[in-house]
Every structure is written in structure tokens, then in C-alpha cells.
């Protein structure tokens, strides 16, 4: 047969679906690899073919579309499972072809088991909401296309294993879940179970979102350097170890890049001849404020080292800060060398 443009295994799309639930999976070719959509391809005489490789097998085989109750079917560029089974796990390939053209891509599909409290190996999307903000809404994700707009499904929301009924600041409103003045105690996994009828059968869709309450934009500040500060003097004798922590607080800012660095006499540590070690540690508060500590250490400090200018710098999207450490030689009355 003619050569086929093979996009390989698209591991960017690690699709996970729950066992015994409907799943609709769009062929990734039209979403990520080709410039035209399925309708255009279809009207040009191209055919979409599906096949799969079972888990732990090498053999590609066609998908059986003649199962009882049409358990697996294809509709346009969508592969349907009504419902999935555990052994549907494998790599699925969709191929678009005619006599002169061929393009295909494979993607992994994992069918995941869950327990009665919705615990599973499924990776959940994370929704960050600002603490004390007025109202935050989350919407039951990835349920579009499963039922027509004429069908009104029933939706039940859970926090962890508990149905959300009479939660003081969390209100289920159909597909939406509203949080009023959220607090850190609202952190957790929120699950919507959507139940809809189709051809005399009831299907369930289970979707979980992890809610993380984070610091509010109104509290966002430039970095605050706790250490070094003007109150602490690092007084050392030559030959001793000099250890200076640069401890910086960063309030949570969505998508902010927080940086901490040292300069010695205005240069980065890598650009000076001093034998310096820098160790960094990071800790987070309950609202994802960040405290970043960079410890600068010189094992055996020289008199020259004790005359250098050590400055801690910090930066985030709100601004920059810097603070010099007060370093002096023991028994030496001043931090600067005396010039006569």
C-alpha cells in the first residue's frame, strides 16, 4: 500500500475514562495534526478508519463495531463506548485515507476503575479559586456531546464521598457548583455524577475537579525579603564558615515566576572566584504563598571575602527587591577596609 503519514503515538493525549461509563473520543488528527476538519475530509472522499492495539500486545487489530447493543460505535470523527470495559485499555489509531492519501495517529486510552468514593488512578483537573473572593463557579467538565440539549440530566455533586447538601458556602446548581467567599477548608475533590437516559438505558458520567483555594490578587505584593536584614550582622574570623540565608516571601500570584538570586560585588556567584555553595529550599502556605530560601555559604572565609558586598535579590510579576547582608571581620570595628 501507499506510504502513510504516521504521526506516531500521541502521548500528549493520555486519555483516561472510567470503567462502565460512556466515553466519546475524538480522532486527534483533526484537532492537532491536520489543517482541515472531518467534514471537509469526508466531503473530499477521505475515509476515517479506526483500529487498536490491546494493552501488552503488539498486534494491531480492527475495532469490533458489531458488539451487542452497539457498545462501540463510530459517529463522524468520534469513537463511542457505551459503556467502556476495563479491557478496552490500549493504544487506539485513527487513520484518514483514500487511494492516494493516508494520515494516521495513535493515542493511549486507559480505562480506570473507581471505588464508591470516586477514588481512582484518574488525574483530575485543578481549579484554583481566590480566597474570600465573592463567588466562584466550577462547571462539571467534559460532558458536552454526550446527550442532546433536549435531555435534562440529573446532576449530583459530592465533596470527597459526601453529597453536597446544606453546605453553608457551597451551592449545587445543576452542572455548576458555586462557592461563596471560599476558604481553605473548601480545598478538596469535587465530583459531579451526571445521569442521563439513552435508548431506554441510564448512563452515568463521573467527573472530578480538585479545588485549591489560593491567595487573592488584592493581596499580591512584590517580594518581601525577611533575611538578610539590617538587624543581623554576620561577624566572622578568617577561616570560619560564612553562612547567609536569603529568605524571601512571595504572595501567591497566578502564573508568576518567582526568582531569588545572590550577587557578590555585583556579580553572579558563578562569575566570581570565591568558592561558594548555594542551596535553595521552598515552602508553601495553605494558600500557596511561597517562601524561598537560598543559603549562601563559604566554607573557609578569607579577609577579602569579608570585605565583599553580598546582596540578595528577588523578583516576581509585581516587582523586585534587594537587600545587602551586613558582613564584617571579627574584631574589626568597621565593615569597610580603612584607606589612609
Amino acid at each position: 500500500s501507499e506510504r502513510c503519514d504516521d504521526w506516531g503515538l500521541d502521548t500528549m493525549r493520555q486519555i483516561q475514562v472510567f470503567e462502565d461509563e460512556p466515553a466519546r473520543i475524538k480522532c486527534p488528527l483533526f484537532e492537532h495534526f491536520l489543517k482541515y476538519n472531518y467534514s471537509t475530509a469526508h466531503s473530499s472522499g477521505l475515509t476515517l478508519i479506526w483500529y487498536w492495539t490491546r494493552q501488552d500486545r503488539d498486534l494491531e487489530e480492527p475495532i469490533n463495531f458489531r458488539l451487542p447493543e452497539n457498545r462501540i460505535s463510530k459517529e463522524k470523527d468520534v469513537l463511542w463506548f457505551r459503556p467502556t470495559l476495563l479491557n478496552d485499555t490500549g493504544n487506539y489509531t485513527c487513520m484518514l485515507r483514500n487511494t492516494t492519501y493516508c494520515s494516521k495517529v495513535a493515542f493511549p486510552l486507559e480505562v480506570v476503575q473507581k471505588d464508591s468514593c470516586f477514588n481512582s488512578a484518574m488525574r483530575f483537573p485543578v481549579h484554583k479559586m481566590y480566597i474570600e473572593h465573592g463567588i466562584h463557579k466550577i462547571t462539571c467538565p467534559n460532558v458536552d456531546g454526550y446527550f442532546p440539549s433536549s435531555v435534562k440530566p440529573s446532576v449530583t455533586w459530592y465533596k470527597g464521598c459526601t453529597e453536597i447538601v446544606d453546605f453553608h458556602n457551597v451551592l449545587p446548581e445543576g452542572m455548576n457548583l458555586s462557592f461563596f467567599i471560599p476558604l481553605v477548608s473548601n480545598n478538596g475533590n469535587y465530583t459531579c455524577v451526571v445521569t442521563y437516559p439513552e435508548n431506554g438505558r441510564l448512563f452515568h458520567l463521573t467527573r472530578t475537579v480538585t479545588v485549591k483555594v489560593v491567595g487573592s490578587p488584592k493581596d499580591a505584593l512584590p517580594p518581601q525579603i525577611y533575611s538578610p536584614n539590617d538587624r543581623v550582622v554576620y561577624e566572622k574570623e578568617p577561616g570560619e564558615e560564612l553562612v547567609i540565608p536569603c529568605k524571601v516571601y512571595f504572595s501567591f500570584i497566578m502564573d508568576s515566576h518567582n526568582e531569588v538570586w545572590w550577587t557578590i560585588d555585583g556579580k553572579k556567584p558563578d562569575d566570581v572566584t570565591v568558592d561558594i555553595t548555594i542551596n535553595e529550599s521552598v515552602s508553601y502556605s495553605s494558600t500557596e504563598d511561597e517562601t524561598r530560601t537560598q543559603i549562601l555559604s563559604i566554607k573557609k572565609v578569607t579577609p577579602e571575602d569579608l570585605r565583599r558586598n553580598y546582596v540578595c535579590h528577588a523578583r516576581n510579576t509585581k516587582g523586585e527587591a534587594e537587600q545587602a547582608a551586613k558582613v564584617k571581620q571579627k574584631g574589626n570595628g568597621c565593615t569597610e577596609p580603612m584607606t589612609l
Partner: antibody
């Protein structure tokens, strides 16, 4: 200096209405959630209602839900509590208080007395 | 809602002595607990937040401890101005709830 000053209390008949105000000064009002807390004569403190700093989110104690409405005007640095269908058990000193999740109710007004009696 | 229970209801202490007030939550409130002092005819005043952090201007003789469900307010050496009613309050979950109060009176 942070100051909260309540007004609007008084004597009202059961079933009547009253609107309390709380004028804030000395801080950036629009950055803080605000609450009403009440204290019946000789009793303890009871949280009544809260409003988010942006005014969009509101919460109420079950005892006042559907009867009381909290609101704020950030341009006037003022918090309000509209109280309808008042009952004898609503008789209390009503305090407005500033809140943060990190520090709870860190500043309180001096209170205004609401008496519901026929 | 989370129920806060304070004990004792009344504590009789001599000036200069130590006072220990207890507060128990019906479920964990982490460290999201505050203590307030209220004198007759006055508004409550924040003493402690985060279970153990003193509010601005609060003397060092006031200290808080505990986390989860058990909390303590300690006044190391009672001064005459410390005789008042003390309330604990959780702000972990809405609705924020108060204990019924402990009255500290002169013995």
C-alpha cells in the same frame, strides 16, 4: 487608625424593618470582607452575615436567611444590613466587624442596639 | 455547623495568678481559631488568631495554643484589666461560630 461606626438601630415592632449602616475608615475598605455579628442582652456572640470584599458573595446564618440582606458600597466605605420581618429574638446589639481568613474579626465597631418589641 | 464549647463557664482567679481557658471544637478547625476579650458595654477585642498568634498591641501575658479540636488561652499573670468575658471562635468553615464564653472574675 481603623474605625467602624454603626448606626440605624432603634425600637421596631415585630414584622417591621430596619436598615443598619457601618461607616468604615482608616483602611482600604474594598480589600476586606465585612460581617455583622450580634449579641442578645446577656448572651454570647452570634455571627449573622458576611460579604466578600468585592460585594458579590454573601452568606447568612440560618436564623436570618431570607429576612436579612447584607450589602456594601465600596465607593462610600459603608456596609449595610437590611433587616425585614423582624422578630423578638432579633433583639441584640449588632456589631460590624472586618474580617480576613488569616486574622478572623480583627476590628469591631462599638455596636448599635436593635430592640424588637410591641 | 461546627459547635464550639468553652470551659469553664466562670473562672474565679486572684490578680497575679494564672488563668487557663479551654475551647473545644466539634470537628477539626486546623489552627483557624481566634480568642476575643469583651468587657461590659464594650465591643469584643481580638486577642489571638491562628490559635497562637497575638494580635497587634496585645500584651505577652496572653498566649494561645492548640490545633485541631482542642485549644487553650492562657493569661500568665492576671491584671485588673483582664477581668472580662473571653470567647473563642473558629473561622475554618462557614458559618463562623463562637463559643458561649468564659467569664473570668476576681476571686
Amino acid at each position: 487608625e481603623v474605625q467602624l461606626l454603626e448606626s440605624g438601630g432603634g425600637l421596631v415592632q415585630p414584622g417591621g424593618s430596619l436598615r443598619l449602616s457601618c461607616a468604615a475608615s482608616g483602611f482600604t475598605f474594598s480589600h476586606y470582607g465585612m460581617s455583622w455579628v450580634r449579641q442578645a442582652p446577656g448572651k454570647g456572640l452570634e455571627w449573622v452575615s458576611a460579604i466578600s470584599y468585592d460585594g458579590e458573595g454573601t452568606l447568612y446564618a440560618d436564623s436570618v436567611k431570607g429576612r436579612f440582606t447584607i450589602s456594601r458600597d465600596n465607593s462610600k466605605n459603608t456596609l449595610y444590613l437590611q433587616m425585614n420581618s423582624l422578630r423578638a429574638e432579633d433583639t441584640a446589639v449588632y456589631y460590624c466587624a472586618r474580617f480576613r481568613y488569616y486574622t478572623a474579626f480583627d476590628y469591631w465597631g462599638q455596636g448599635t442596639l436593635v430592640t424588637v418589641s410591641s | 455547623e461546627i459547635v464550639m464549647t468553652q470551659s469553664p463557664a466562670t473562672l474565679s482567679v486572684s490578680p497575679g495568678e494564672r488563668a487557663t481557658l479551654s475551647c473545644r471544637a466539634s470537628q477539626s478547625v486546623s489552627s483557624n481559631l481566634a480568642w476575643y476579650q469583651q468587657k461590659p458595654g464594650q465591643a469584643p477585642r481580638l486577642l489571638i488568631y491562628g490559635a497562637s498568634t497575638r494580635a497587634t498591641g496585645i500584651p505577652a501575658r496572653f498566649s494561645g495554643s492548640g490545633s485541631g479540636t482542642e485549644f487553650t488561652l492562657t493569661i500568665s499573670s492576671l491584671q485588673s484589666e483582664d477581668f472580662a468575658v473571653y470567647y473563642c471562635q473558629q473561622y475554618n468553615n462557614w458559618p463562623w461560630t463562637f463559643g458561649q464564653g468564659t467569664k473570668v472574675e476576681i476571686k
